[in-house]
């Protein structure tokens, strides 16, 4: 019915307004409504103006799209011509009474379908249903994925690409770890991945200045070391260094009036030369204090070495050896005087004898046929050596003696000349001064070591070798090497060290093989004025220890492997060091600081006498130990 009406309207329009000219009222009769008439008539007049006679040619050349008046007029009532809808977005256009309706394609909206619908912003379908990226396009949208992801067949979901499974060799020798959207080539700690070589390369942490003092890089890691010999230890951060602090202060007060006899490990502490009238006889008076049992107090000789007198200590008693053109004698006598007390000693040459007194009591009288030293040219010339003798004398002694003597003398009077000139010499030399108070023991000042040659091989034992160590210690600092066995190749196959514990005011004892701690005895209170007793027994199969708190046999998985390392070293040659380490690399042991404090050592049943050492640092006191510093009220 509608189309019939349209056809009628079209016929009327043809008749009224094209074949003839129509006015607005005539046009109203055609359309039968005002809106269409009002829409039509102004446009009709434009058509007339365009196609009137005389204008036709010009019109054809103008922008007018219609070839003639008929087509121009017929097009006016069709609201969809020219097309009002957006060509991209419309599906169809419906003509209406002076109006039109654009039907939009999916994804478009608006009266003319000119607006794209943004599906990615649709609140009812978040992100357009895309799991990752929603890309809006004119009239549509599509989902896409981030790098390292792949679209599933539903075109909405993105799945991570497992590069490690996809390309198993992608990381070369490193371990491939898949992560969302990517992958990582992982290396063990201490290694860095090299993209070029596709391999893990050791990080040289030492080049990054990780350590305060010394740094040793090794594959996969690094270790910081501090110069223990200069009094430093590694701090808890395992990077910086801190001073090895004193945990038990000692009374290190000295007096220049007290002459220290053990200033030199090998050598004379003081040498004097007397030129006196020939009527003079040899005499020496002094106060003497020691815990040492053997050593030279003084040695006197004539200028031509033909006569000599040795005053020494053997077994804690005074011994006199003398030799001149008339006689050769050795005498030991009196009470034991290595008791740490001051003993007044006098040796006086009388007309027919040499008198030795202790505390003014005669203990020995040695007969002599003539003068001890022969005067020459009216003068008695005598050389006196304290705490030693010239090297060549050693072979001339009646009975060999270890000359080293850890002791002190005071109030000396030689050749009845008093202390003239000597005190001034001593006063300037600090290391010739003796400690005011000492106790029994050996003192390691934290600046040097003592070396022994000990044969640990036990032929009668199936183990082949054994090391049984007893230590009586009273440390003054909480860190240091007490005992170390050192191989010829500068490794340390066994060491017993002290380290400050992580728990306050206590120490740990470390047993180490090379640079590995094989056992740690934790949190012992060793920095006290009481001595601590420690025992270790080691052979190629076992490690036993005894501390003030427990006795135990150590066994753990790695121990046998470490004992095998020790066994190999013990079958070769090892040197024994007390109080620290010789010049071995810092990395040779877990601890490299010198031990500071008192310590007595017994190895395989033999009490070690530091006077018997192959070498000993001068500052180590073989038979005396400073007392613990006591706070006084006014100090």
């Amino acid at each position: 019915a509608n189309s019939l009406l349209e056809e009628t309207k079209q016929g009327n329009l043809e008749r009224e307004c094209i074949e003839e000219l129509c006015n607005k009222e005539e046009a109203r009769e055609v359309f039968e409504n005002d809106p269409e008439t009002d829409y039509f008539y102004p446009k009709y007049l434009v058509c007339l103006r365009s196609f009137q006679t005389g204008l036709f040619t010009a019109a054809r050349q103008s922008t007018n799209a219609y070839p003639d008046l008929r087509s121009c007029v017929n097009a006016i009532p069709d609201q969809c011509s020219p097309l009002p809808c957006n060509e991209d977005g419309y599906m169809s256009c419906k003509d209406g009474k002076a109006s039109f309706t654009c039907t939009c394609k999916p994804g478009w909206q608006g009266e003319k379908c000119e607006f794209d619908i943004n599906e990615c912003k649709d609140p009812s379908n978040i992100n357009g249903g895309c799991s990752q990226i929603c890309d809006n396009t004119p009239g549509s949208y599509h989902c896409s994925c981030k790098n390292g992801f792949v679209m599933l067949s539903n075109k909405k979901d993105c799945k991570d690409v497992d590069e490690c499974s996809l390309k198993p060799s992608i990381c070369g020798t490193a371990v491939c770890k898949n992560i969302p959207g990517d992958f990582e080539c992982e290396c063990p700690e201490g290694y860095r991945y090299n993209l070029k070589s596709k391999s893990c390369e050791d990080i040289d942490e030492c080049s990054e200045n990780m350590c305060a003092q010394l740094c040793v890089n090794y594959p996969g890691g690094y270790t910081c070391y501090c110069d223990g010999k200069k009094g430093f230890k590694l701090a808890q951060d395992q990077k910086s260094c801190e001073v090895v602090s004193v945990c038990l202060p000692l009374n290190l007060d000295t007096k220049y009036e007290l002459l220290y006899l053990a200033e030199q490990f090998a050598g004379v502490v003081l040498y004097l030369k007397f030129r006196l009238p020939e009527i003079s006889r040899f005499s020496a008076e002094f106060d003497f204090r020691t815990y040492d049992s053997e050593g030279v107090i003084l040695y006197a000789e004539s200028i031509d070495h033909s006569a000599w007198l040795l005053i020494a200590l053997r077994g804690g008693k005074i011994e006199v050896q003398l030799k001149n053109e008339h006689t050769s004698k050795i005498t030991t006598g009196g009470d034991v005087i290595n008791n740490g007390l001051w003993n007044m000693v006098s040796v006086e040459e009388l007309e027919h004898s040499i008198s030795i007194k202790i505390a003014k009591e005669a203990v020995m009288d040695i007969n002599k046929p003539g003068p001890l030293f022969k005067p020459e040219n009216g003068l008695l010339e005598t050389k006196v050596y304290f705490a030693g003798f010239p090297r060549k004398v050693e072979s001339e002694l009646i009975k060999p003696i270890n000359p080293r003597l850890d002791g002190c003398i005071r109030s000396w009077n030689l050749m009845k000349q008093g202390a003239s000139g000597i005190k001034e010499i001593i006063q300037e030399k600090q290391n010739k001064h003796c400690l005011v108070t000492v106790e029994k023991g050996s003192y390691y000042p934290g600046s040097g070591i003592a070396q022994f040659h000990i044969d640990y091989n036990n032929v009668s034992s199936a183990e082949g070798w054994h090391v049984n160590v007893t230590l009586n210690i009273r440390p003054s600092t909480g860190t240091g090497v007490m005992l170390a066995l050192v191989s010829g190749n500068n490794t340390v196959p066994f060491a017993v060290s002290l380290v400050d514990s992580t728990s306050e005011k206590s120490q740990d004892i470390l047993l180490s093989v090379e640079n590995t701690v094989i056992y740690r005895i934790q949190a012992l209170s060793l920095c006290s004025d009481q001595q601590s007793h420690l025992e270790f027994r080691v052979n190629r199969n076992n490690l036993e220890l005894s501390t003030p708190l427990k006795i135990e046999t150590i066994s753990h998985e790695d121990l046998q492997r470490q004992l095998a390392v020790l066994d190999k070293a013990m079958k070769a040659k090892v040197a024994t060091y007390l109080g620290g380490l010789p010049d071995v690399p810092f990395s040779a042991t877990p601890v490299n600081a010198f031990y500071n404090g008192c310590m007595e050592v017994n190895i395989n049943g033999v009490q070690l006498d530091l006077d018997e050492a192959i070498s000993k640092h001068n500052d180590i006191r073989a038979h005396s130990c400073p007392s613990v510093w006591k706070k006084t009220k006014n100090s």
Epitope: L152, S153, K159, D160, V161, D162, N178
Partner: antibody, heavy 119, light 106 residues
Amino acid sequence: EVKLEESGGGLVQPGGSMKLSCAASGFTFSDAWMDWVRQSPEKGLEWVAEVRSKADNHATYYAESVKGRFTISRDDSKSAVYLQMNSLRPEDTGIYYCTLTTAFLFDSWGQGTTLTVSS
Amino acid sequence: QIALTQSPAIMSASPGEKVTMTCSVNSSVSYMHWYQQKPGSSPRLWIYDTSNLVSGVPGRFSGSGSGTSYSLTLSSMEAEDAATYYCQQYSGYLYTFGGGTKLEIK
């Protein structure tokens, strides 16, 4: 829309051969990895074989249980994947699914074709 | 070879009830995928990369886990969720499926 259609199933005697086909549409076949997965009441779901894309040199992989007996192949011009099965055993019985595989998961599945190996 | 063990093999739940099924692996894997299969139909990818729901899968489903232990959880059981669920992984050129967990509605 992804469509996978298997064909070629049926009854076959032990020791016999059979060739399964899978016609694919709705995606860029030449870029896709295609797999066969089978299902039986006894063994449940069991991966059989995989053929990768041209970019991956059409590499093929097989489950241990079918290695040396089954051959997977593809024809990119026909968007088809095949499974040639020889020396068939009763335990090969089951529904054989053709799958579109994306990044090591079975993204889309066909309806399956049934293979029965029995005398 | 990597083996996946699903438990329980069969379970039933009332509507609204929370359901958890597990998939244990004998060796550590990076990801786990889950499939749903209803009788007479092919399996459908349901959860991928351990915890991602495929578009259209109801939000009441969730996946979790790492290493050797993975799980699929259904916060509130509905009748349409009754199906068999399979876990799957890929490692060393081999794909492996679990034996499946059959979820029934009470």
